[in-house]
């Protein structure tokens, strides 16, 4: 069961796995949640009654019964991991801790104007986990305004002490705020020859890459496939680092694959969610339970519902045995990965889906695209919303996209003449406008946030956020789309679609059924040639066919230009403006969302 509140002056007895240092109980709970085995924790706050060496200790705990005896202890704060909860979880921690020195390896020291600048430096440094900044009031003159970038093996401080006039905080890489490049390249037949910081067993290079991405010290990896000549190293995933942050040497070896941590784009890829099944593969580990199950899918469900289960192996039933049910072996290990992987024994293995909630909801696979035709089907574009105005009468005003459970991203020009958010209604999960009746549920708009540099669509900054009055419960028909990653600026999107209920030609009316069109992106140079009277800036992106014929049009404004990359949909553009609709050599112009990621995160993550 999910218990979110913290228990003051309470200590859980026994069950210790490991002790780390965290600046707060809240962050201790996050660390516990991300630890493969932690279910409960006890944090010790600073207190005159406590030994200062125990201040800020975060003891991670496990228990077969999922609970432990409670003991009263002043300054102790205890609680449960969020593994038991169904809500979305994030490791993003923007808090700044005043008068705390978080200890680690100080590998970089430089002058910074502010703690914010120091945090940005940490976020954009490949090695940095956290920082300490000496303010201008710091007693020692030569240390004032010094920004110390730090890292540790675990990503958490090795100790935390009180120190006047300093502030500390964490890298914001997990908040999607890093400008570091996202290196998606995978190199077949390649070994990276740098130092190993850890090794785990993985069924394929993609799982290995995801493990590397959420490992605090891993910058790149080498994976030995099941055909690797040395039997003892088959399925071995080597997690690696180097001083420069890139591999210093790569060596060609058949049946090995190498790649990089995707830390700087982890908000738009699944990292914790290993959803594939591995056939004729057995995962070895500590056995938690053996249960009868009808299929490997059922076995995965059982594992997902058992909070301590990390992975499973299903052995299908022998003919007519046990009512056709096979054996489902629920398993766990110290690091969440199998201790060994065996092939050729007929088992089907996989991982718990419990950790999928640690990934951004937007990375969830949606139903396959319907090929051909222009009308969409239900659930095809679950992030698409229709924004209605109720004044003077109710009508469709613009499109928009769900990007968070309380946030819609749309175009600023939609709100020309809109005096108040009170007249706006957001409908999600809608296919046909005719579904919208008096009693159809909608989301009220609490706030309209228009980019403060917006003047008119053609001059850019045509972007706005709607904060909803209530939160969206994600379902198959209403869920968010991922924002593009700042580290992915060099990605070329080839599978892009524009959707909306807008006109199908210049003089037309709003369509009843949500329309879709696949449209190729056009380079800004090419686009500029087509719009000589306008300035096509890097904050705009264009899409269209040279011959015309398919385009967004009136009423599509604010809606998404959605592009699929590596099985994940990204909100690449917001329908903004164009000359006419679907005219020859007149591509549609969209707001280039990647250029506004910082602005979006600043507005949506504001405390």
């Amino acid at each position: 069961e999910c218990v979110t509140q913290l228990l003051k002056d309470t200590c859980f007895e026994g069950g210790d796995i490991t002790t780390v240092f965290t600046p707060s109980a809240k962050y201790c709970q996050v660390v516990c949640t991300y630890h493969p085995r932690c279910l409960l924790f006890t944090f010790t706050a600073e207190s005159p009654s406590e030994d200062p060496t125990r201040w800020f200790t975060c003891v991670l705990k496990d228990s077969v019964t999922e609970t432990l005896p409670r003991v009263n202890r002043t300054a102790a704060i205890s609680g449960y991991s969020f593994k038991q909860c169904s809500h979305q979880i994030s490791a993003c921690n923007k808090d700044i801790y005043v008068d705390l020195d978080m200890k680690g390896i100080n590998y970089n020291s430089s002058v910074a104007k502010s703690a914010q600048e120091c945090q940005e430096r940490c976020t954009d440094d490949v090695h940095c986990h956290f920082f300490t900044y000496a303010t201008r009031q710091f007693p020692s003159l030569e240390h004032r305004n010094i920004c110390l970038l730090k890292h540790t093996q675990t990503g958490t401080p090795t100790r935390i002490t009180k120190l006047d006039k300093v502030v500390s905080g964490f890298s914001l890489k997990s908040c999607a705020l890093s400008n570091l490049a996202c290196i998606r390249d995978i190199f077949p037949n390649t070994v990276f020859a740098d130092s190993n910081i850890d090794s785990v067993m993985a069924p394929d290079a993609f799982v290995c890459g995801r493990i590397c991405t959420h490992h605090p010290g891993c910058l790149f990896f080498t994976f030995f496939s099941q055909e690797w000549p040395k039997e003892s190293q088959r399925n071995l995933c080597l997690l690696k680092t180097s001083e420069s942050g890139l591999p210093s040497t790569r060596i060609k070896k058949s049946k090995a694959l190498s790649g990089f941590s995707l830390q700087s784009c982890r908000h738009s890829i699944p990292v914790f969610c290993h959803s594939s099944f591995y056939h004729d593969t057995d995962f070895l580990g500590e056995e938690l339970d053996i249960v009868a199950a009808k299929s490997h899918e059922a076995c995965q469900k059982l594992c997902t519902n058992a909070v301590r289960c990390q992975f499973f192996t299903y052995t299908p039933a022998q003919a007519s045995c046990n009512e056709g049910k096979g054996k489902c072996y629920l398993k766990l290990s110290s690091n969440g990965s199998p201790t060994k992987i065996l092939h050729g024994r007929g088992g089907i293995s996989g991982y718990t889906l419990r950790l999928c909630k640690m990934d951004n909801e937007c990375t969830t696979k949606i139903k396959p695209r319907i090929v051909g035709g222009t009308a969409s089907v239900r659930g095809e574009w679950p992030w698409q919303v229709t924004l209605h105005t109720t004044s003077p009468t109710q009508r469709h005003l613009c499109g928009g996209s769900i990007i968070g459970n309380q946030w819609i991203l749309t175009a600023a020009h939609c709100f020309y003449g809109v005096e108040s958010p009170k007249i706006l209604r957001v409908y999600s999960g809608i296919l046909n406008q005719s579904e919208i009746k008096e009693d159809t549920s909608f989301f009220g708009v609490q706030e309209i946030i228009i980019h403060d540099q917006y003047k008119m669509a053609e001059s850019g900054y045509d972007i706005a956020l709607l904060k909803l009055e209530t939160t969206v419960n994600y379902t198959d028909s209403q869920r968010p789309i991922c924002l593009p990653s700042k580290g992915d600026r060099n990605v070329i999107y080839t599978d892009c679609w524009v959707t909306g209920w807008g006109y199908r030609k210049l003089r037309d009316k709003i369509q009843n059924t949500l329309q879709k069109a696949k449209i190729p992106l056009v380079t800004n140079e090419e686009c500029q040639k087509r719009y000589r009277g306008h300035k096509i800036t890097h904050k705009m992106i264009c899409a269209g066919y040279r011959e015309g014929g398919k385009d967004a049009c009136k009423g599509d404004s604010g809606g998404p230009l959605s592009c699929k990359h590596n099985e994940v949909w990204h909100l690449v553009g917001i329908t903004s403006w164009g000359e006419g609709c679907a005219q020859r050599e007149r591509p549609g112009v969209y707001t280039n969302v990647v250029e506004y990621v910082d602005w979006i995160l600043e507005k949506t993550q504001a405390v």
Epitope: I183, T249, I251, N490, V491
Partner: antibody
Framework: EVQLLESGGGLVQPGGSLRLSCAAS????????MQWVRQAPGKGLEWVSS????????MYADSVKGRFTISRDNSKNTLYLQMNSLRAEDTAMYYC??????????????????WGQGTLVTVSS | DIQMTQSPSSLSASVGDRVTITCQAS??????LNWYQQQPGKAPQLLIY???NLETGVPSRFSGSGSGTDFTFTISSLHPEDFATYYC??????????FGGGTKVDIK
């Protein structure tokens, strides 16, 4: 048809800078690793630098490390080599070349299967 | 760094001759070796990749063999257009990607 066209070479004084470009066409540029290789007059081939498809992973010969920067713009199908602090020994014909394969299928070779015609860089006072 | 030693550095031959060039690596490079041809004033052209695979469009008179440290490149019957400089290149360990010193094949 695959084509690579280098430009940006010329005469420059020692200590000066040049930026070479290589415009690619006829293939999906963003799927391929790219390389710069140079050849001093009357001499053999010398590898200079390489860059991965996404542009995030780069490598350099010791002789140019810290002075040259390889980059790419996948939206423009263009590879670049920014050359700073040029020396007389950097005088050469500079070729851009494409690595043969970039997929996860069985046959994966890093042979350089297409080369540009080269651009001449002369460093002299 | 892996050194590639090519021999001979030059050779003279006649049309129709069989020509053999060798390349030796300073350490084991498995089969990760390529062969290129460069005609005067032109860019290099790939002939053989991964020690023995003939590049598409390259005549079958060109062949390669070997693995580990010793490699051989052969032209079974020299054509007039084959007078050029030939280079071997390893890509087993990077950086650097290294080329042999080249073998110039000219007319006897």
């Amino acid at each position: 048809e695959v084509q690579l066209l280098e430009s940006g070479g010329g005469l420059v004084q020692p200590g000066g800078s040049l930026r070479l470009s290589c415009a690619a066409s006829g293939f999906t540029f963003s799927h391929y690793s790219m390389q710069w290789v140079r050849q001093a007059p009357g001499k053999g081939l010398e590898w200079v630098s390489s860059i991965s498809p996404s542009g995030g992973y780069t490598m350099y010969a010791d002789s140019v490390k810290g002075r040259f920067t390889i980059s790419r713009d996948n939206s423009k199908n263009t590879l670049y080599l920014q050359m700073n602090s040029l020396r007389a020994e950097d005088t050469a014909m500079y070729y851009c070349a494409r690595e043969k394969a970039s997929d996860l299928s069985g046959t994966y070779s890093e042979a350089l299967d297409y080369w540009g015609q080269g651009t001449l860089v002369t460093v002299s006072s | 760094d892996i050194q590639m030693t090519q021999s001979p550095s030059s050779l003279s031959a006649s049309v129709g001759d069989r020509v053999t060039i060798t390349c030796q690596a300073s350490q084991d490079i498995d089969y990760y070796l390529n062969w290129y041809q460069q005609q005067p004033g032109k860019a290099p052209q790939l002939l053989i990749y991964d020690a023995s695979n003939l590049e598409t469009g390259v005549p079958s008179r060109f062949s390669g063999s070997g693995s580990g440290t010793d490699f051989t490149f052969t032209i079974s019957s020299l054509h007039p257009e084959d007078f050029a400089t030939y280079y071997c290149q390893q890509y087993h360990t990077l950086p650097p990607l290294t080329f042999g010193g080249g073998t110039k094949v000219d007319i006897k």
